[in-house]
Interface confidence: medium
């Protein structure tokens, strides 16, 4: 709305940088062939690039990434009883970000 | 995969708490009747609840919210020239979070 301007602080752009995000660990990251198990923890923190750039034609992108393997519990339910196993999930952390030009494909003439 | 367990750290649950997120300011928050303008900044930071809870039947939810009005620029394009106006957008910040029981509707018998 265009009203109540007095109390409003000027909006500050969310700059293009890494922020902590929550990543949901889906079961198919661990085992695509079997659905009869649970994963613990169900979510973890990752570092991801987010925010806006000063120009419309650029986008906030990761310029440096790091793969980080973490151990999770694969809880298989066999005859209503759990069997705990370890599994490794590889997470992607963004270490640095940059505002990158969006390359739009040119129409073929 | 169940391989390469040695190098992997145990995964730590992303606890239910407020984290900084990026909120895209869409034009229809400012004016639903007109599309012939731009908004600056296009995105801002907000505090939002995210993460997982220890229990299957609970979800991370905001227990306390605060509305925060911010001033943005509405840049109208009139005859190819920009006209700058002020507009207020009200953002929702989460101040506190809790793991709340998910109420699943019981089937009618």
């Amino acid at each position: 709305s265009l009203g109540s301007l007095a109390a409003a602080e000027p909006a500050v752009i969310a700059e293009c940088k890494t922020r902590t995000e929550v990543f949901q660990i889906s079961r198919n990251l661990i085992d695509r062939t079997n659905a009869n198990f649970l994963v613990w923890p169900p979510c973890v923190e990752v570092q991801r690039c987010s925010g806006c750039c000063n120009n419309r034609n650029v986008q906030c992108r990761a310029s440096q990434v790091q793969m980080r393997p973490v151990q999770v519990r694969k809880i298989e339910i066999v005859r209503k009883k759990p069997i705990f196993k370890k599994a490794t999930v590889t997470l992607e952390d963004h270490l640095a970000c940059k505002c990158e030009t969006i390359v739009t494909p040119r129409p073929v003439t | 995969s169940l391989g390469s367990l040695a190098a992997a750290e145990p995964a730590v649950i992303a606890e239910c708490k407020t984290r900084t997120e990026v909120f895209q300011i869409s034009r229809n928050l400012i004016d639903r009747t007109n599309a012939n303008f731009l908004v600056w900044p296009p995105c801002v930071e907000v505090q939002r609840c995210s993460g997982c809870c220890n229990n299957r039947n609970v979800q991370c939810r905001a227990s306390q919210v605060q509305m925060r009005p911010v001033q943005v620029r509405k840049i109208e394009i009139v005859r190819k020239k920009p006209i700058f106006k002020k507009a207020t957008v009200t953002l929702e910040d989460h101040l506190a979070c809790k793991c709340e029981t998910i109420v699943t509707p019981r089937p009618v018998t």
């Epitope: 809880i75 759990p82 | 750290e9 220890n54």
Partner: antibody
Amino acid sequence: EVQLVESGGGLVQPGGSLRLSCAASGFTFSSYAMSWVRQAPGKGLEWVSYISDDGSLKYYADSVKGRFTISRDNSKNTLYLQMNSLRAEDTAVYYCARHPYWYGGQLDLWGQGTLVTVSS
Amino acid sequence: SYELTQPPSVSVAPGQTARISCSGDSLGSYFVHWYQQKPGQAPVLVIYDDSNRPSGIPERFSGSNSGNTATLTISGTQAEDEADYYCSAFTHNSDVFGGGTKLTIKR
């Protein structure tokens, strides 16, 4: 204060029964799995039984299977262990303990224990 | 049934590093926890999920687990670390404890 308090221990004759209780306070009891662990005098720890947060999963050590029953009343924040057909080798301090997650995991909170003596 | 084997006793001089082992078949495939128990007291969790320390546990306590052996390491041992230590793993449908290790701090 977050705590677990066991009660119901005592002297019982072989073949007799006893019901142990564990009162939880200071945390949301219904969100946690629970276990009973025992320790015979001068011996090590022995896991006895486990129950999931909602009571749907229960399992037991082979040494007590068919004689002991674990249960919980989430409305009363209380864990139980019904012990039947007691034997001399069941003599031990019985601890109730909390798992931090609904599925189990480590035991992050223990009660002070209640002594059960099976003797004629 | 699954078994975890610990040495009955370990002795170390104050300030030195104590290592307590826990062995079991393919133990590295399971998460191991360690508990400390002092005479007349309930056990206390000191390490969980192989190597994580609960809040309030001193940094001198650390853990590792690979292959068939998990190890609890106490660096710079202090007199108050004298206690019984138990490893534990949740395997097929049951929580298993090792037989316990008595840690003695030589005076």
